[in-house]
Structure formats: structure tokens, C-alpha cells
């Protein structure tokens, strides 16, 4: 049924509604650090260059269907995608010597989530099953936050949007049977 | 046309069993989610029970799980619903529903033809 | 489970327009669809899926539904639309449907 043309599991499902997973810990408490939507960065920055774009946290909207297995949100939800470059990066010369590279140097700022937010949504699922409630975590605010190494391993890894997230503490689903009968009133057997 | 016939209503004293029978025609009944629903009187809809169209799946108000046991024979064109354990607040017109998937994936699966309803009296 | 509530009753003018609203929990996320039931009579579905008509409904029935308020719109309501109407959504957390509370329409 063109289900994977929907696949995307960077939205995390909380496995029941009454639990919903606390954001992870300021990594950097900087109250002067400009609001991410406006492009801002910290302020006297080691390595600030005049070029402010290398520094921009944008938030980017994106609409996009939930997915839990073979299930799928009745609608579309729309949630943020942190992008962009807060660097700090040096400019520094290549080893061939013909021209520059960007290589991280110094603390190492991310555009990652900083808030997030819980959203109801109703599941449709193929192979006669009922839809169901259920809620969601999204992306509500984007940040630049100064990561250490360790924390480069851990929590770039779990705001990744790209790959798909482990569902914690949930079976996964049974596949949906296949249909048997004349596919057109099929559709309707659900 | 499509008709939901439905039967087995009557007076059963507290604790006692009862079975709803809610015979289809004019669509092909096996392809179809089918559900029940009840109303009490002078009351609003209170959803019952779920069957899918191969009775692979089943779901129920948590009012009813447990003593209610919903089924289907289609080869007979018939849904049921078992009531064991009843209480004087199962007492309702019980409705069956044929249930309808509009668009992709069902979209929100709609109630769209009902039964006239059959009436379940739990009285001593 | 999210709760759908709607108001115990609504009053219109004959050719007036009529809303009923239904509200829950982020219930725009949901689709939501509408019964009509006349006294003595089986639930007839007036609107599916938000703002679709089944065949035979009448073209002055519409809905809407976003954020937390599902709205169902009767424009030019007639003398025989007076009934007992109710929302509808697969709401529950494991497979439930949840209807809203009784809504009585009376057209003055």
C-alpha cells in the first residue's frame, strides 16, 4: 500500500501516553546565546569570523506523516529540523596545499533540538487493525549547544533526523496479512 | 441495498448471558470491518466492540472486555455478540455498524450504515 | 482516551446556519466524522473523514476540523434537520472509537 514512501522514523512514538521522555540536559547554560531562528551564535567567540552564516542554527519546517511500524498518521504533522552550521571551524589549508577545508576545532557547537514538544496523533494501521491515539514526541525549538567529545558520540546520535530511531521498550509490530480476497472490496476488510 | 438486521434483544436477569445476532445483506459482507454499538436510554452512543473483516482482529470499551465476545460467521453473513455477566447498565438498544474505509489506509474509518437496533433489558 | 465534548444543545433559525462544535485534545490530528439520529431511529453518518459527505446527505451539511475544535456546519438548516447529533473518532489509545456527548438540535 506505499507504505514506505512514508517511512521515516526520526519522530519518536512514546510507547505509552502517560510517559513522556524528558529532553536531555542543558549541555551549555548560555542565557546571552541568541534565539536559534535568528541565525545567532555565542557572542565573543574564540573563533568568530565576520561571515554570520557559518554560525546559523535554522529551524526548518517539516511536514511529514508519522510511521510505528506499518502504521501510519491519519494526517501529516509538521515539526522542526535543526540545520545548519554553528561551528566553531577554522579555515585551514589542505595537504595538498591548493585552496581551504573546514575542519572542526576547538569546543564543538551543534544545531540540535533544544525543546520539544508532545503531540497526539491517530494511527491507521493496514491488516484490520483499529486506529489508536497516540502521542508523539517532536521538535519545537532548535539550539546551538557546545558538546563535548563524549557527548558528540551520545547525543548527536539521538537527534539524528536522518536515521531511523530505535522505538525503546516497544515490540515491534506484526506485519499486516496479506489479502485474500478481490482486492477492490478489499480495501475496505481494513 | 445494504440492511442490518439485528436480533436476540430481550429481558435476562443480572448475571446472565445473552447473544446478539445481526444478519447482513446487500454487500459483501467478509470485506467489511463490522461493530457494535450501544445506547442506552435517553442516553448518547457508547462504542461496544470491533471485529475486522477475517476476524484476525477485535477490540472492545473497556466496559465490556472481559464478558463480552464479539464474532463473525462469514459464510453466513452474520455478526454476533456474546454478553455474559450482565449488568443493569449493559440495559441498551445494541446497534450493529458496518464500518467503512474512505480513501487510503481507511482514512478514519466511518460508521456509515447502521442496524435499527435490537433492545437488551438487565432487570430482576 | 481523549474525551470529546459538545454542547448539550444548539437552537437556529429555520434557514439560518447551524455549528456544532466538537473539542478534544488535539482532535485536528484525528479524523472525525458526524452522526444524525432522529428520535426512535438508527445513527445516520452525515459526514466522514473531517468534511466528506456520504451520497445522499444533503449538500448544506459541511464539517471542519483543526486544532482542538472539530466543527460541524449546517447552513440553511430546514425544520428537518431537528435531531440528536454526535462526533466520532478512533480516539482511544488501544483501539477505541469515542463518541462526543449528545448534541440536540432544535430549529426555532
Known amino acids: 500500500q506505499g507504505w514506505q514512501a512514508f517511512k521515516n522514523d526520526a519522530t519518536e512514538i512514546i510507547p505509552e501516553l502517560g510517559e513522556y521522555p524528558e529532553p536531555p540536559p542543558e549541555l551549555e547554560n548560555n542565557k546571552t546565546m541568541n534565539r536559534a531562528e535568528n541565525g545567532g551564535r555565542p557572542p565573543h567567540h574564540p573563533f568568530e569570523t565576520k561571515d554570520v552564516s557559518e554560525y546559523s542554527c535554522r529551524e526548518l519546517h517539516f511536514t511529514r506523516y508519522v510511521t510505528d511500524g506499518p502504521c501510519r498518521s491519519a494526517k501529516p504533522v509538521t515539526e522542526l529540523v535543526c540545520s545548519g552550521q554553528c561551528g566553531p571551524a577554522r579555515l585551514l589549508p589542505n595537504a595538498i596545499g591548493r585552496g581551504k577545508w573546514w575542519r572542526p576545532s576547538g569546543p564543538d557547537f551543534r544545531c540540535i533540538p533544544d525543546r520539544y514538544r508532545a503531540q497526539r496523533v491517530q494511527l491507521l494501521c493496514p491488516g484490520g487493525e483499529a486506529p489508536r491515539a497516540r502521542k508523539v514526541r517532536l521538535v519545537a525549538s532548535c539550539k546551538c549547544k557546545r558538546l563535548t567529545r563524549f557527548h558528540n558520540q551520545s547525543e548527536l546520535k539521538d537527534f539524528g533526523t536522518e536515521a531511523a530511531r530505535p522505538q525503546k521498550g516497544r515490540k515491534p509490530r506484526p506485519r499486516a496479512r496479506s489479502a485474500k480476497a478481490n482486492q477492490a472490496e478489499l480495501e475496505n476488510a481494513y | 441495498q445494504v440492511q442490518l438486521v439485528e436480533s436476540g434483544g430481550g429481558l435476562v436477569q443480572p448475571g446472565g448471558s445473552l447473544r446478539l445476532s445481526c444478519a447482513a445483506s446487500?454487500?459483501?459482507?467478509?470485506?467489511?470491518?463490522m461493530n457494535w454499538v450501544r445506547q442506552a436510554p435517553g442516553k448518547g452512543l457508547e462504542w461496544v466492540s470491533f471485529i475486522s473483516g477475517d476476524s484476525s482482529n477485535t477490540y472492545y470499551a473497556d466496559s465490556v472486555k472481559g464478558r463480552f465476545t464479539i464474532s463473525r460467521d462469514n459464510s453466513k453473513n452474520t455478526l454476533y455478540l456474546q454478553m455474559n455477566s450482565l449488568r443493569a447498565e449493559d440495559t441498551a438498544v445494541y446497534y450493529c455498524?458496518?464500518?467503512?474505509?474512505?480513501?487510503?489506509?481507511?482514512?478514519?474509518?466511518?460508521?456509515?450504515?447502521w442496524g435499527q437496533g435490537t433492545l437488551v433489558t438487565v432487570s430482576s | 482516551d481523549i474525551e470529546l465534548t459538545q454542547p448539550p444543545s444548539v437552537s437556529v433559525a429555520p434557514g439560518q446556519t447551524a455549528r456544532i462544535s466538537c473539542s478534544g485534545d488535539?482532535?485536528?490530528?484525528?479524523?472525525v466524522h458526524w452522526y444524525q439520529q432522529k428520535p426512535g431511529q438508527a445513527p445516520v453518518l452525515v459526514i466522514y473523514d473531517d468534511n466528506n459527505r456520504p451520497s445522499g446527505i444533503p449538500e448544506r451539511f459541511s464539517g471542519s476540523n483543526s486544532g482542538n475544535t472539530a466543527t460541524l456546519t449546517i447552513s440553511g438548516t430546514q425544520a428537518e434537520d431537528e435531531a440528536d447529533y454526535y462526533c466520532?473518532?478512533?480516539?482511544?489509545?488501544?483501539?477505541?472509537?469515542v463518541f462526543g456527548g449528545r448534541t440536540k438540535l432544535t430549529v426555532l
Open positions: 488535539n482532535i485536528g490530528s484525528f479524523y
Open positions: 446487500g454487500f459483501t459482507f467478509s470485506s467489511y470491518v
Open positions: 455498524a458496518r464500518t467503512f474505509m474512505h480513501g487510503h489506509l481507511g482514512g478514519g474509518l466511518s460508521m456509515d450504515f
Open positions: 466520532g473518532s478512533w480516539a482511544g489509545s488501544s483501539g477505541s472509537y
